[in-house]
């Protein structure tokens, strides 16, 4: 049974091959039950979590995971060596950096050890599943009386990332957002010195090194300005 699995994980264009052994319709066996889908995410190319919904099994089952890379030097079948658990039942596998090869087709196979014919295999493009860490060290530079420049750092190759900057004044409920390319710099040409601004940034592994759909977490917010202070006096100026 070959089927295309549409998932929000950046692999919509990838055909997943499910090899599900089916039994005659008159003997309803556990073998007819589909296995849960495996979802993999590569976190900052430091480790990868491949997880599945263990509660979808009719009874608690320690499913096993094997993986390999298709048509490559790494095509030897590997057993998961670091399982993730949910209520003492396997619900995922964590792979370390040395086991991640972004630009080779990753094949992951889930199996019911009690019913070995009950297995499902998926092929994933890992470069579409990278989620970077949130941007760090946000700083604002006042370029002129009315112009601010926002800078930040990422713990990854800058050219591989695009960014989304959001800002708002005071504590409005809606954000203004702006896409930023790999240069990880954002300028706001006209700021109102009477208002207080909040900025935050998130990043995505797209489009130069991969086609990931998922954004990082938002950075910690950073603030600028206040309708009550031009800059001085500082809050704790007595201790200067």
């Amino acid at each position: 049974l070959n089927t295309t699995i549409l998932t929000p994980n950046g692999n919509e264009d990838t055909t997943a091959d499910f090899f599900l052994t089916t039994m005659p319709t008159d003997s309803l066996s556990v073998s007819t039950l589909p296995l849960p889908e495996v979802q993999c995410f590569v976190f900052n190319v430091e480790y990868m979590n491949c997880t599945w919904n263990s509660s979808s099994e009719p009874q608690p089952t320690n499913l096993t995971l094997h993986y390999w890379y298709k048509n490559s030097d790494n095509d030897k079948v590997q057993k998961c060596s670091h399982y993730l658990f949910s209520e003492e039942i396997t619900s995922g596998c964590q792979l370390q950096k040395k086991e991640i090869h972004l630009y080779q087709t990753f094949v992951v196979q889930l199996q019911d050890p009690r019913e070995p014919r009950r297995q499902a295999t998926q092929m994933l493009k890992l470069q579409n599943l990278v989620i970077p860490w949130a941007p760090e060290n946000l700083t604002l530079h006042k370029l002129s009386e009315s112009q601010l420049e926002l800078n930040w750092n990422n713990r990854f190759l800058n050219h591989c990332l695009e960014h989304l900057v959001q800002y708002r004044t005071d504590w409005d409920h809606s954000w203004t957002e702006q896409s930023v390319d790999y240069r990880h710099k954002f300028s706001l040409p006209s700021v109102d010195g009477q208002k207080r601004y909040t900025f935050r940034v998130r990043s995505r592994f797209n489009p130069l090194c991969g086609s990931a759909q998922h954004w990082s977490e938002w950075s910690h917010p950073i603030h600028w300005g206040s309708n009550t202070s031009k800059e001085n006096p500082f809050l704790f100026a007595l201790e200067a």
Partner: nanobody, 119 residues
Framework: QVQLQESGGGLVQAGGSLRLSCAAS????????MGWYRQAPGNEREPVAL???????NYPDSVKGRFTISRDTAKNTVYLQMSSLKPEDTAVYYC?????????????WGQGTLVTVSS
């Protein structure tokens, strides 16, 4: 640089009160505003209170009238007095300081203190 250390979190019954403290150290003269955010599990970080250099304060509607922010300049400390607490106030509370050195601005963050309000 500016370092921040929160304290005062804990478990409290709904309707009760709690006071959080945030002690600033380092180049405290570069701070021009301080405040608190909070983050409940699965939610985004949201602002709770702000105090600026002129002792002006600001609060979102969700806590207005229940929370009060104040500061003790001599101790380089900001306080968040929380009263009439509700279960939905349960979150990790983070202190922050807005800092300016020359023309460069940044925001320093504490590690957070957990507040749990039981019903």
């Amino acid at each position: 640089q500016v370092q921040l250390q929160e304290s005062g979190g804990g478990l409290v019954q709904a309707g009760g009160s709690l006071r959080l403290s945030c002690a600033a150290s380092g180049i405290t003269s570069s701070i021009y505003a301080m405040g608190w955010y909070r983050q409940a599990p699965g939610n985004e970080r949201e602002p709770v209170a702000l105090i600026t250099s002129g002792d002006n304060t600001n609060y979102p509607d969700s806590v207005k009238g229940r929370f009060t922010i104040s500061r003790d300049t001599a101790k380089n400390t900001v306080y968040l007095q929380m009263s009439s607490l509700k279960p939905e106030d349960t979150a990790v509370y983070y202190c922050y300081a807005d800092v300016v050195i020359g023309t460069t601005y940044y925001t320093s963050w504490g590690q957070g203190t957990l507040v749990t309000v039981s019903s």
